[in-house]
């Protein structure tokens, strides 16, 4: 599952909220990033997160599609210099500062079940979710194709404005 | 190789419906969202929806809501598009497309079937 | 919905030219359009994709550019068998909408 190119294909700021329109939260505590799951006060504001998408051979292609069988995976920064990475021994979800290139770890499978929500899967971890778990975002095994509608690893992305990629 | 065969021309009433299908071939048909596009002469190029074999997920363009029902058939790999309560305004080719990504719509049209030439006359 | 203006409608150019076509949204886009080529009694076939990235099998001479509002699909020395409709899209957001179109007609 190579990444084709070193530069993301196109880039995205936009707030992420649960299915349920729970707000996920940045916070700094301690020189290291928390993040939660919460319900926000009305005129709060929610934080925004640079979506990068790249493109990235299918590791088979044994659907026949050849050169086409393409995914996107996508990087999620908060923040500059930290990004979302797939914890798959803790089954967690952290933000962690990399430095470009960064680890598998940080790269998820983007999925649209829906036409208005994603999904991502773990790179590292095929089949292993970002989902929501006791107001906290955690990794969560889905195990058929059929529990990928499952509401708690669906999340909706509110573009507040594209990112120019240089 | 990827492909996207389509049924062949209808001359139909109006008032009457059409449903024409989209049978396909060379890729894992449940894991791509299949749109359809509209060409006439009138309007150019009109995306009308698309459809998720995998949840049966759909997507709409407002201005073919209650015109357009789409759905798919797994065990064949063949999507299918109904449109009804047809008038002058629904004779165009009509053509079912794929895009490039596995598990995601960006609504890029990466593969087109050949369309189907829909004609509406009493 | 975003409204895409192509211009000019059609062109006439000799083979080995250069042209370029342009497509202008009424909004915003970022990078999110595409290229399509169409010649008579075919379907459309994707050329470019976020705006600069070039399809699987399509020629290098076909050249994606422009960000925002304001793109550019440039043909770099023309073949006879570029003779065709050229349509601009806007992706990634529902509803997708396209341009109508620049013709190129070869001298």
């Known amino acids: 599952m190579s990444i084709t190119g070193i530069s993301p294909i196109t880039e995205y700021l936009a707030s992420l909220s649960t299915y349920n329109d729970q707000s996920i939260t940045f916070a700094l505590e301690d020189e290291s990033y928390e993040i939660y799951v919460e319900d926000l006060k009305k005129d709060e504001k929610k934080d925004k997160v640079l979506l990068s998408y790249y493109e990235s051979q299918h590791p088979s292609n044994e659907s026949g599609d050849g050169v086409d069988g393409k995914m996107l995976m996508v990087t999620l920064s908060p923040t500059k210099d930290f990004w979302l990475h797939a914890n798959n021994k803790e089954h967690s979800v952290e933000l962690h500062k990399s430095e470009k290139p960064l680890p598998d770890q940080a790269f998820f499978v983007l999925h649209n079940m829906h036409s208005n929500s994603v999904s991502f899967e773990s790179k590292t971890d095929p089949g292993v979710f970002i989902g929501v778990k006791d107001n906290h975002l955690a990794l969560i095994k889905v195990d058929s194709s059929e529990n990928l509608s499952t509401e708690n690893i669906l999340f909706k992305l509110s573009e507040t404005h594209h990112h120019h990629h240089h | 190789q990827v492909k996207l065969l389509q049924s062949g021309a209808a001359l139909v009433k109006p008032g009457a419906s059409v449903k024409m299908s989209c049978a396909t071939s060379?890729?894992?048909?449940?894991?791509?969202?299949v749109s359809w596009v509209k060409q006439s002469h009138g309007k150019g190029l009109e995306w009308i929806g698309e459809?998720?074999?995998?949840?049966?997920?759909?997507n709409f363009n407002e201005n073919f809501k209650g015109k357009a029902t789409l759905t798919v058939d797994k065990s064949t790999s063949t999507a299918y598009m109904e449109l009804s309560r047809l008038t002058s305004e629904d004779s165009a080719i009509y053509y079912c497309?794929?895009?490039?990504?596995?598990?995601?719509?960006?609504?890029?049209?990466?593969?087109w079937g050949q369309g189907t030439l829909v004609t509406v006359s009493s | 919905n975003i409204v895409m203006t192509q211009s000019p409608k059609s062109m006439s150019i000799s083979v080995g030219d250069r042209v370029t076509m342009n497509c202008k949204a009424s909004?915003?886009?970022?990078?999110?359009l595409a290229w399509y080529q169409q010649k008579p009694g075919q379907s459309p076939k994707l050329l470019i994709y976020?705006?600069?990235n070039r399809y699987t099998g399509v020629p290098d001479r076909f050249t994606g550019g422009g960000y925002g509002t304001d793109f550019t699909l440039t043909i770099n020395s023309v073949q006879a068998e570029d003779a065709a409709f050229y349509y601009c899209?806007?992706?990634?957001?529902?509803?997708?909408?396209f341009g109508g179109g620049t013709k190129v007609e070869i001298k």
């Open positions: 497309t794929r895009g490039p990504y596995y598990y995601s719509t960006q609504i890029i049209f990466a593969y």
């Open positions: 459809i998720y074999p995998n949840s049966g997920a759909d």
């Open positions: 899209q806007r992706i990634y957001n529902s509803p997708p909408t």
């Open positions: 060379g890729f894992s048909f449940t894991d791509y969202w």
């Open positions: 976020y705006a600069s």
């Open positions: 909004q915003n886009v970022g990078n999110n």
